[in-house]
């Protein structure tokens, strides 16, 4: 990373250093330490104070983004004296060169696309690179397949999501021969970026008085069970006047996904389609293929 770290410290320095790969802030241990604390302040003056590691000469920041620039601070008291040191972590490089409009989505349960746009002041030879680290920080994933626009990486396709956890850190670095390129970073929850497939195995069975719709929950990247799903059924009578209201039915996920509704014979031709969402987010999938039942002369 091209970020330059500037230290603001008194004469006897703690030698504070920050490793952006592990998000670990460390300093030289002092003898007879009685108190130590570390924290960061971001550009909006929000303070993040993590727990100190056991040896008390380092701390790890779990869920932080650095692209707006932050200031780290370490306070140490020993039985003899007090130490205080600031470490500025700016996002160096020309303003407006970082990747922008960054977003990712998971689809088909095991694929992910991330896209971004070139920074407005980025030079023509800019190249961007995406790195992903999971919340356990055990592994860094480098983008395996870049999507390009005139030779510049503007997206990434991943077909192996095994390294991801429920929350992940995304970093887009940039390089250029002409000038320094700023980085962009973001924390994303997999549950918020997954787009579900529509429900599968949709069937309709009718008897003389009722019709029973059954379906299977979609396969998802997240480990979800039946109560995590909400469904919407669109039961639609065919050949009705334009502007006629469709009947939208909300159904909670269940061990056996089914919806039974009165429909007596002879019944007109109807179609039913279903979509699915996470019950807490209601980010609807696309509709399943319409299934027809009934007859034209009903």
């Amino acid at each position: 990373e091209k970020s330059d770290l500037r230290t603001v410290a008194p004469a006897s320095s703690l030698n504070v250093r920050f490793d952006s790969r592990t998000m670990n802030l460390s300093w030289d241990c002092q003898e007879n330490t009685t108190f130590s604390k570390c924290f960061l302040t971001d550009k909006k003056n929000r303070v993040v104070e993590p727990r100190l590691s056991n040896n008390e000469c380092s701390c790890t920041f779990r869920e932080i983004c650095l692209h707006e620039g932050v200031t780290f601070e370490v306070h140490v008291n020993t039985s003899q004296r007090g130490f205080q040191q600031k470490l500025l972590y700016p996002n160096s490089g020309r303003e407006g060169t970082a990747a922008q409009n960054f977003s990712c989505f998971i689809y088909n349960a095991d694929l992910m696309n991330c896209t971004w746009a070139r920074g407005p002041t980025a030079p023509r030879d800019v190249q961007y690179f995406l790195y992903i680290r999971n919340s356990k920080r055990r592994r860094e994933i480098r983008c395996p397949y870049y999507i390009q626009d005139s030779g510049t990486h503007v997206g990434c396709h991943l077909d192996n999501l095994s390294g991801l956890t429920s929350r992940n850190y995304f970093l887009v670095n940039g390089t250029s021969r002409e000038i320094g390129i700023q980085f962009f970073d973001s924390l994303l929850d997999t549950k918020k970026i997954e787009r579900f497939n529509p429900p599968s195995n949709v069937t309709v069975r009718c008897n003389t008085t009722h019709c029973l719709v059954r379906w299977k929950q979609p396969r998802t990247y997240q480990k979800l069970s039946y109560l995590d799903f909400q469904y919407q059924l669109d039961v639609h009578r065919k050949n009705t006047q334009p502007g006629t209201e469709n009947l939208l039915i909300n159904v909670s996920g269940d061990l056996e996904n089914r919806y039974n509704f009165p429909s007596s014979e002879p019944r007109a031709k109807h179609s039913v389609k279903i979509r699915a969402a996470d019950v807490r987010i209601l980010n609807w999938s696309s509709w399943s293929e319409a299934i027809e039942f009934g007859s034209d002369d009903g």
Epitope: S225, Y226, L227, L255, E256
Partner: antibody
Framework: QVQLVQSGAEVKKPGASVKVSCKIS????????IHWVRQTPTKGFEWMGG????????VYAQRFQGRVTMTEDTSIDTAYLTLSSLRSDDTAVYYC?????????????WGKGTMVTVSS | QAVLTQPSSVSGAPGQRVTISCTGS?????????VSWYQQLPGTAPKLLIY???KRPSGVPDRFSASKSGTSASLAITGLQADDEADYYC???????????FGGGTKVTVL
């Protein structure tokens, strides 16, 4: 109709082991996750363990670690709980439950329970 | 001693509204982890009433509702009926214990 059918009541001596079964009907066990919870009049409900999707394995409550084993036979849609080195305070009703959501986790459907009595 | 604290009993006349509190800590309800509520009729297995803090599974009447704030949660039963007489338990996840935790239960009596 999905049901969890548990094995019958057991009486065991201290130091012995007990194996409780939980058969799922109306659904495939391979598509579900089972957890085990016990209930005593004094301690109330105690979670014992079950499948954790983040770890992709069965995890056990710390207090039962080393004494408890949870297994599954998906060919007959049956889950098993084995508790060894039984003590009198293991006398309880043991429930299997289907996880309806891993966020919680939420126990969407419970078996009727198996009464295990530990007495000399 | 249960990790989540509930009153041991509450009572109300038919048609009345009763509420049951469930108090946890920063490692469970306040972490924040979701809260579920279960009803246990005498001599039977527990039945899920509420999940994800305030969602009702299909088949549970809308007389049952729940909410969560900070390190506490509560269950409300409106239009109390004789067959609501049961024990009610709250449940959540606790990060320090790395597993599910339950309340000690509240006996609801319909006067």
């Amino acid at each position: 109709q999905v049901q969890l059918v548990q094995s019958g009541a057991e009486v065991k001596k201290p130091g012995a082991s007990v194996k409780v079964s939980c058969k799922i009907s109306g659904h495939s066990l391979s598509e579900l996750s089972i957890h085990w919870v016990r209930q005593t009049p004094t301690k109330g409900f105690e979670w014992m363990g079950g499948f954790d999707p983040e770890e992709n394995e069965i995890v056990y409550a710390q207090r039962f670690q080393g004494r408890v084993t949870m297994t599954e036979d998906t060919s007959i849609d049956t889950a098993y709980l084995t508790l060894s080195s039984l003590r009198s305070d293991d006398t309880a009703v043991y429930y299997c439950a289907i996880v309806g959501s891993f966020s919680g986790p939420v126990y969407g459907l419970w078996g009727k329970g198996t009464m295990v009595t530990v007495s000399s | 001693q249960a990790v989540l604290t509930q009153p041991s009993s509450v009572s109300g006349a038919p048609g009345q509204r009763v509420t049951i509190s469930c108090t946890g800590s920063g490692s469970n309800i306040g972490a924040p982890y979701d809260v579920s509520w279960y009803q246990q009729l005498p001599g039977t297995a527990p039945k899920l009433l509420i999940y994800h803090n305030n969602k009702r599974p299909s088949g549970v009447p809308d007389r049952f509702s729940a909410s969560k704030s900070g390190t506490s949660a509560s269950l409300a039963i409106t239009g109390l009926q004789a067959d609501d007489e049961a024990d009610y338990y709250c449940q959540s996840y606790d990060s320090s214990l790395s597993g599910s935790v339950f309340g000690g239960g509240t006996k609801v009596t319909v006067l």
